[in-house]
Amino acid sequence: LTCLGGFASPGPVPPSTALRELIEELVNITQNQKAPLCNGSMVWSINLTAGMYCAALESLINVSGCSAIEKTQRMLSGFCPHKVSAGQFSSLHVRDTKIEVAQFVKDLLLHLKKLFREGQFN
């Protein structure tokens, strides 16, 4: 029983599971979208694929008061090795280019699906 107890206790979530859950959350957001997501807020676009999780979080963390993406923000923070706070700006962003949150979420979903297919879980 002592040994079996170890299986029941929650351990770290495997990266593949975490990525699948993030994809599921983004699918949820894109499918359930009725009014403009986050009142049509704009976020910085990203121009590279490396370090994408932190860059994506840096973009989305600047959207406040939007409950629809709060779970996504929390999930992305689990993929980013450093603490991200509002106002941070990564070299991965296209400084002059902002896009709508809804489009950003849709694009992020596309990219994460590709990573999942390719087995890139981190």
């Epitope: 990203i46 694009d107 596309l110």
Partner: nanobody, 118 residues
Framework: GVQLLESGGGLVQPGGSLRLSCAAS????????MGWARQAPGKGLEWVSS????????YYADSVKGRFTISRDNSKNTLYLEMNSLRAEDTAVYYC???????????WGQGTLVTVSS
């Protein structure tokens, strides 16, 4: 919203060269596979070339292989098509487009006309 704006078309003599550009905005260009298609007068749409999101893998139609080169600059949100040794049969409207398998990610530009004639 999403915009794909082609430029660089024009009139060129057979054997000449042109470089088409496609400026993308309103979406995360760096995460999309992209491509070029063309439509010759009175003909159907032909897929010419595509490139993956990172720019490492490319595809070319047999009709342009060895003459056309596709490339991209993700830092500039721009897709390119370098066209050399142009022939009369390359005359067409060239369209920049996303090249994703899921058609909810299907975006097209308005096109730019390339005319190869002496």
């Amino acid at each position: 919203g999403v915009q794909l704006l082609e430029s660089g078309g024009g009139l060129v003599q057979p054997g000449g060269s042109l470089r088409l550009s496609c400026a993308a905005s309103g979406f995360t260009f760096a995460w999309y596979d992209m491509g070029w298609a063309r439509q010759a007068p009175g003909k159907g749409l032909e897929w010419v070339s595509s490139i993956d999101d990172s720019g490492t893998q490319t595809y070319y139609a047999d009709s342009v292989k060895g003459r056309f080169t596709i490339s991209r600059d993700n830092s500039k949100n721009t897709l390119y098509l370098e066209m050399n040794s142009l022939r009369a049969e390359d005359t067409a409207v060239y369209y920049c487009a996303t090249a994703e398998r899921d058609d909810t990610y299907d975006y097209w530009g308005q096109g730019t006309l390339v005319t190869v004639s002496s």
